[in-house]
Structure formats: C-alpha cells, structure tokens
Amino acid sequence: FERTRSLQDPCSNCPAGTFCDNNRNQICSPCPPNSFSSAGGQRTCDICRQCKGVFRTRKECSSTSNAECDCTPGFHCLGAGCSMCEQDCKQGQELTKKGCKDCCFGTFNDQKRGICRPWTNCSLDGKSVLVNGTKERDVVCGPSPADLSPGASSVTPPAPAREPGHSPQ
C-alpha cells in the first residue's frame, strides 16, 4: 500500500480493509487475519465476530465486512444484526421466562416466535364469527347477521386477516 498523501489527515486515504498504521509512519496496512475495517480512515481494524454456540455463520468475515450470524435450528434472530438468538416455540405458544407456554383461551400465535395475540373481535366490525379461533389461528369473521337475511347475498368475502404483531383497535 502506498503512503497516504492527504494534507489534513494522512489516514483519511486509507481504504476499507486497511488501517492507518502509526507504527509504520502512518502507512495504510491491510487488516490482519480475523479482523476488518468497513470504512476508510480507520486507525485500527475490528476483530471479526465469532458465530458459534447458538449462532452459526451466515457469511464469513472479510477484510472489509464483519461476519454475519444467524441462529441454529430451534432458535431465531432478535435485534440488529442478529445480536441475540431466541428459542422457537410451537405455533399456539409464546416464550415466557419459564419457557414455551400455550396461548391462553381467546389468544393465538400462528408463528414460532412472538407473543399470543387476542382473537379479532368480529362484532366490533359489525360481523359475526364464521370460523372459531384456536391457539394457532385467529377467528375468521363472516358477514354480519343482517347480511344473512333472506334475499341478501352471502358471498361477502371475510375481512382480511390482521397483520402479525398488530392488536385489534
């Protein structure tokens, strides 16, 4: 690597994947093995992340980017950059401090992560329950009782399912 020539900061020309080596008269030196610098002008390289234990390597480290981790089977990522792995539960359960617990009556979880959420209250939309809810599935709302009066069409499509993570208003 050439000696940097910047008049302000001689380190500013050191590209990603290198560091400005004060021990070598501020020459841009490549990051040592198992380290990286993702931006230019760095005075040190950061040690690569180890994806082990409950983590697995999704992408190995390079001189310009940190390793990326995901989680071993039975766990899922939480936090920015998969900073934590959280245990999966079965559908119809949620994770508590004491482990996976079944959803209480009137709530459901259709994923292996997240919390149990209340069934949709069909009557709030003036509709009736077409299909009962379970621990794993929300209720399906159908047409309102008035819509089912003689001569009324009964092919009204059910209300769209709520997005995961949203509670009823």
Partner: antibody, heavy 115, light 107 residues
Framework: EVQLVESGGGLVKPGGSLRLSCAAS????????MNWVRQAPGKGLEWIAR??????????YYADSVKDRFTISRDDSKNTLYLQMNSLKTEDTAVYYC??????WGQGTLVTVSS | DIQMTQSPSSLSASVGDRVTITCKAS??????LAWYQQKPGKAPKLLIF???SLETGVPSRFSGSASGNDYTLTISSLQPEDFATYYC?????????FGQGTKLEIK
C-alpha cells in the same frame, strides 16, 4: 439440520491420486469458509486445508505436510467441497473429515495409501 | 506456526472426579481456542469455543478458562460418558493447530 457427508476414500498406491468430496446441506454454503482435517490411525487431529468463500476470493491455505500435493476447491452450485490428493504417500493414510465453523464435522472417509 | 502443547497426554480418573486438561499456545491466539471430545470411530465434538464459551447442548460440567496463553478444560464431576480423548485447537492463525490430545481413562 447441518449435514456434511464425505466420500471418495479408498485404497490407493503410493504416488497415486484420489479426490474426496464433501456434500454440505443445512446451512448457507457459498458464503462460508470450509476446512479439511485428517486423523491418522491411532494419532491426533491435523488441520490440512482451508478454502474461503467468494467474498474472500476463494483464498486457499494448506498445511506444510500437504502443500503442492493437495488442492482444496469448491463448487458452490453443488454445495460441495473437494480435496484433490496427488503424489500420495503412506503417511497420508488417515480418516479425512470436512469441517465447518469448528462445530460441524462429517463422519469422515478413510484413505489408505499402501502398496 | 503456533504450537499447542497439551497436557497430560493421558489421565486416569474415576466417576465423580474433577479433571483438568491444559493447553499452552506458543503465541497469542486472542482466545480463539476450541476444545473437542472424540470417541473411537467418531468425529470430534465441539465442547468449548472462544476459550470459555460452552457449545449449545454441552453439559454445564464442562468449562473452559484462559490465562494469558494458557488454556484449561475442566470437567467438574466426571460421568461415565466422559471417558474419551480431548483435543484443544487454535483457530486464530493459519495453519490451525491442535494439541496432541489427552486420553481420559477409567481408573
């Protein structure tokens, strides 16, 4: 579930060649580095080769004991790791393991070099 | 190359005993050290990574510690299934190197 399955071992004469394969599944193969480690009968473990992924230009590294005789390679489209072994010596007799991330190992394939 | 000097090479102990195995690195490895257990005819099994972190699913009687370039694997109370050969490995610097192994036998 991560699986590493080695194949290609067998009996070969000194000076001969053999190509080992390791079929990988259950993880993202093409962005990960991979290793070959061997174990001679009744002996300890010896790391012999490593290949990095595309982001590291498929860089390869070898133990001195196999340098210039063995070649590690990979086919990311097939999720397969290879070890081409040439000019084999009797001291290359060993179980050969492919390895990912220290935690994951294949069952091993036995290579016997004997006249 | 970094040499990993493992001791003892063999060890006799009884069920319930506390056992320690040590590995000394000839140079700095930044705690990038793994401990493995291997049983005859089987692949090595990772026990400890990063010198002190327990691999998922490994019993808590196994632990690792580090002091400078000296590394220790401790089994707090030996169980019948723990009789095996143990290896340390540094994965900081290529060539990656293993200790010579410690064969743990029943007394």
């Amino acid at each position: 579930e991560v699986q590493l399955v080695e194949s290609g071992g067998g009996l070969v004469k000194p000076g001969g060649s053999l190509r080992l394969s390791c079929a990988a599944s259950g993880f993202i193969f093409n962005t990960n580095a991979m290793n070959w480690v061997r174990q001679a009968p009744g002996k300890g473990l010896e790391w012999i080769a490593r290949i990095r992924s595309k982001i590291n230009n498929y860089a390869t590294y070898y133990a001195d004991s196999v340098k210039d005789r063995f070649t590690i390679s990979r086919d990311d489209s097939k999720n397969t790791l290879y070890l081409q072994m040439n000019s084999l010596k009797t001291e290359d007799t060993a179980v050969y393991y492919c390895n990912w991330d220290e935690a994951y190992w294949g069952q091993g394939t036995l290579v016997t070099v004997s006249s | 190359d970094i040499q990993m000097t493992q001791s003892p090479s063999s060890l006799s102990a009884s069920v319930g005993d506390r056992v320690t195995i040590t590995c000394k690195a000839s140079d700095h490895i930044n705690n990038w050290l793994a401990w493995y257990q291997q049983k005859p005819g089987k692949a090595p099994k990772l026990l400890i990574f990063g010198a002190t972190s327990l691999e998922t699913g490994v019993p808590s009687r196994f632990s690792g510690s580090a002091s400078g370039n000296d590394y220790t694997l401790t089994i707090s109370s030996l169980q019948p299934e723990d009789f095996a050969t143990y290896y340390c490995q540094q994965y900081w610097s290529i060539p990656y190197t293993f200790g010579q192994g410690t064969k743990l036998e029943i007394k």
